[in-house]
Amino acid sequence: IWELKKDVYVVELDWYPDAPGEMVVLTCDTPEEDGITWTLDQSSEVLGSGKTLTIQVKEFGDAGQYTCHKGGEVLSHSLLLLHKKEDGIWSTDILKDQKEPKNKTFLRCEAKNYSGRFTCWWLTTISTDLTFSVKSSRGSSDPQGVTCGAATLSAERVRGDNKEYEYSVECQEDSACPAAEESLPIEVMVDAVHKLKYENYTSSFFIRDIIKPDPPKNLQLKPLKNSRQVEVSWEYPDTWSTPHSYFSLTFCVQVQGKSKREKKDRVFTDKTSATVICRKNASISVRAQDRYYSSSWSEWASVPCS
């Protein structure tokens, strides 16, 4: 058993049918010694008397808010949550496996640049009685500070007869050095509590591996005289690291016909312009990627040929 926060305790339960459970001793936070009784949640049934209460925690029915009283007055509370292990594996019931980039991916994180700021998000089908707490650091043995905000509900989606909720959090490395080579990964830890269930989820990554630039901005077409060709130009996104001479991007320019089946023409360039043939009813799209490190491509910025 360990303390999650004041008066909230997590009982780690290695569960299997007929498991003996965990013996837990609760102590009433009071100088009083006599006439103390204990109850669980809203029930008036007296579970025991005395300054301490010993309980055997076998299942969620044994968790909840234990209260000690004296003469009708509440003395203190202890909320017991369960962290359940089955077949040697801690439960992961609260969050949905996003299965990208691999199975058992519950947290996904992205950074728009090398400033040390990043966003993580996760999915759940649970709509109520749910709280998250996020901590982060650079390295784990001698951790350097990363400050995370509060997790917020960022999107709701309907998938079949299921509603899916996306939560996200923004974090900032306290002493980020954008140009430095990373040797220690960022660690992100999410505590999730649903009703009386506690679970924790972790992710470990280098900022360079989670980079995903914003799409190029100010995408424009300039027709070339007496030609079907156009000059496409764009700019680095505002959110990308500076100076651009050091933090350089490479670009992919694509001409896509109206039909998805039509052949796509693609051009790769390090410049912020390219000359392509603009077909009728086609559109031109440009996306960006770090020039020197193969992290994710940005989303596409697009304009119609006409």
Partner: nanobody, 123 residues
Framework: EVQLVESGGGVVQAGESLRLSCAAS????????MGWFRQAPGTEREFVGT????????YYEDSVKGRFTISRDNAKNTVYLQMSSLKPEDTANYYC????????????????WGQGTQVTVSS
Amino acid sequence: EVQLVESGGGVVQAGESLRLSCAASGGSFSNYEMGWFRQAPGTEREFVGTINRRGSSTYYEDSVKGRFTISRDNAKNTVYLQMSSLKPEDTANYYCAAGWLYPSSRSRDYDYWGQGTQVTVSS
């Protein structure tokens, strides 16, 4: 919001078997841990057993262990309670319930309830 409808209750002789079904609609059945409870007249609702969302683990009240078996078919959105070697003391209204906490024998840990199906075991 999940709706639950029990079926399969009836009158049987002691020692016989019965299978109860509980059909779920209106929500994603495979997200929920499912439980069976029973209530005889003049008594409190009593835990029978529960099955986890994947159907890989079950947990039973001591008095039904070895006689009752809970299973589920997530493709059919249905949970079953197979009862054998029935005794007169098994006579009760049987309810199925859906919740998020497994295992729990406490009725308030379940969020959705069916209307119940009556089982009568005569000696």
